[in-house]
Each structure stands twice: as C-alpha cells, then as structure tokens.
Interface confidence: medium
C-alpha cells in the first residue's frame, strides 16, 4: 500500500515537472510572440480557422462585403508592406470604389485616427501612370490628390479621407486586403 502511494506521489511529481516545463515553454513562446505579435496571431488564426472554418475573416481582420482588411500595427516601407501582406495570402489594399474608400477611412478613424497607411498603388517609373498591384488603373476619382515632390519612386497611401502620394521608401502603417471566406453552409 505504501509503495502504491509513493508510486502515485512520484507520478504526480513527474506530472508537475512536465507542467512546469510546458508553462516555461509557453512563457518563452509568449515572449517571442510579443515580438512578432502579428505573425503569431496569423498563425493562431490559421490553426483556428482550419479547425472551425466558420468566420469569413481571420481574427483581427475587418470584414466589409466580400473583403477582409488588416490594419497593421507596425511601420514599414511600401515594398516591405507588400511582402508582409503576401505572407498572409493577401495584397496591399486595392480601393475599387468610393464606398470602399468611405468604409476604410471610417474604420481607420475608429481604430487609430489620422495616420498614414500604404495601399497597393504605385506610379510607373516610365509612363508616370498610377497602377494597382494587379496591374489595373485606378478609377479617376481614386487618384492620389497630390503629386509627391520626391525624385524617387512614388507610392500611394491613405490618410484621413484622402488618397495621397509619397516616396515609397518612407515608413508608414499599411492595410492588407483578401477575399472573405464564402460560407460553405
């Protein structure tokens, strides 16, 4: 009987050690997660969405009609912003209509206020034409309001209610866009 009790005690102690180790690992993971919050969130969301597959947009993304939007919490240059979106299976925001522009600017007002956000618009270095990332031209009402005085390559960004232009190498927040998952019900 005593042997049985001591065996159980040893097993409990072993279990406790394993739990402490797991907690330590989790704390370590959480610490590194804080450094790369965006990517950890995306990872966790992917795990969750593959398990449930019910939400049209990943966690921390905003839905409007058929699109999901992610408003970054980090700054980067235009090119790196595009790469960051790419990692999430998305592209920099492509604004198709005034309605979409109004939704975006309204959402930004609620979330963060008047900051600069890169969108997927850049000026062709040769022709000077503005192009979205998919190669299409923006509609006339959605052209950047002011031409940047920069001699460098120029890219588009959203600030308050306006679409503006700036040197692509400046640091700004950015907005990613992807299709919302269609319900399989």
């Amino acid at each position: 009987k005593l042997l049985q009790v001591s065996t159980i005690a040893m097993q409990q102690q072993e279990k406790l050690i394993q739990q402490e180790r797991a907690l330590l690992n989790f704390t370590e993971w959480k610490r590194s997660c804080a450094l790369q919050m965006k990517y950890c969130q995306a990872f966790m969301q992917n795990s969750l969405s593959s398990a449930h597959n019910s939400s049209p947009c990943p966690n921390n993304w905003i839905q409007n009609r058929e699109s999901c939007y992610y408003v970054s919490e980090i700054w980067s240059i235009w090119h790196t912003s595009q790469e960051n979106c790419l990692k999430e299976g998305s592209t920099l925001l492509q604004i198709e209509s005034k309605e979409e522009m109004d939704f975006i600017t309204g959402s930004l007002r609620k979330i963060k206020g008047s900051y600069d956000y890169w969108v997927g618009l850049s000026q062709d270095g040769h022709s000077g034409r503005w192009l979205w990332q998919d190669g299409s031209s923006p509609s006339p009402g959605l052209l950047p309001a002011e031409r940047s005085q920069s001699a460098n390559q120029v890219c588009g960004y959203v600030k308050s209610n306006s679409l503006l232009s700036s040197n692509c190498s400046t640091w700004k927040y950015f907005i990613c866009e992807k299709y919302a998952l269609r319900s399989s019900v």
Partner: nanobody, 116 residues
C-alpha cells in the same frame, strides 16, 4: 528593364497537377517578393499566392493546401505547383513582382484549363 516569362500552362483533367514557372531577368531577383495571380474570363485578376524575399509564402484561401509557391534564386525562377486542380482554377496565370522602389512588373501570362 525587368522581364518575367511564365510557362507550364496547359489542359489538365480535374484532380490533376501542373507546375508553372516564371523566369525573371533584369532584376536583383532574390530581394523581390514574387506573386502569382490569375484571371478567369470576365473576372478580376486575383492573388493566388506569393513568396517573399526571405522565403515566406502566403496563399489565397481558395488554393491553400493545394498550391505551393517556391523559388530558385540561382535560376531567377519562381514556381507554382498546382495539385488537385478544379474546373474553377481555369484562368490565365500571371507572375508579378514589385521592386523595392515600388515599380510593378508582369509576365504575359500562361493559360491553365481544367476540364474533363
């Protein structure tokens, strides 16, 4: 001037596989993110997937688990491996890139038709 050339398209049966290639010239290939897009007749060009300069990949939800993007920096080529193809994957497939300066470049596209 950056040039992109896609190849590998064709007619394939549902459930089949294809591997598309995109060869790049005139660019410091390894520092660029490369993306695959597709455009179905009458539709908009949409992102399929992409690979960043550090090798991270991302995919549209519609192709996740079926398509894989990879790159060979030595050959200046990016690939799109497409498995378990469906009729709705029928489209012209384009590769595209943006340079750090913000310039965007496109290939001419390669037709993929999934039909029995």
């Amino acid at each position: 001037q950056v040039q992109l050339q896609e190849s590998g398209g064709g007619l394939v049966q549902p459930g089949g596989s294809l591997r598309l290639s995109c060869a790049a010239s005139g660019t410091s290939f390894s520092i660029n993110g490369m993306a695959w897009y597709r455009q179905a007749p009458g539709g908009q060009r949409e992102l399929v997937g992409g690979i960043t300069s550090d090798g991270s990949t991302g995919y549209a939800d519609s192709v996740k688990g079926r398509f894989t993007v990879s790159r060979d920096n030595a050959k200046n080529t990016v690939y799109l491996q497409m498995n378990r193809l469906k009729p709705e994957d029928t489209a012209v497939y384009y590769c595209g890139t943006s340079t750090p300066r913000g310039d965007s470049y496109w290939g001419q596209g390669t037709q993929v038709t999934v039909s029995s």
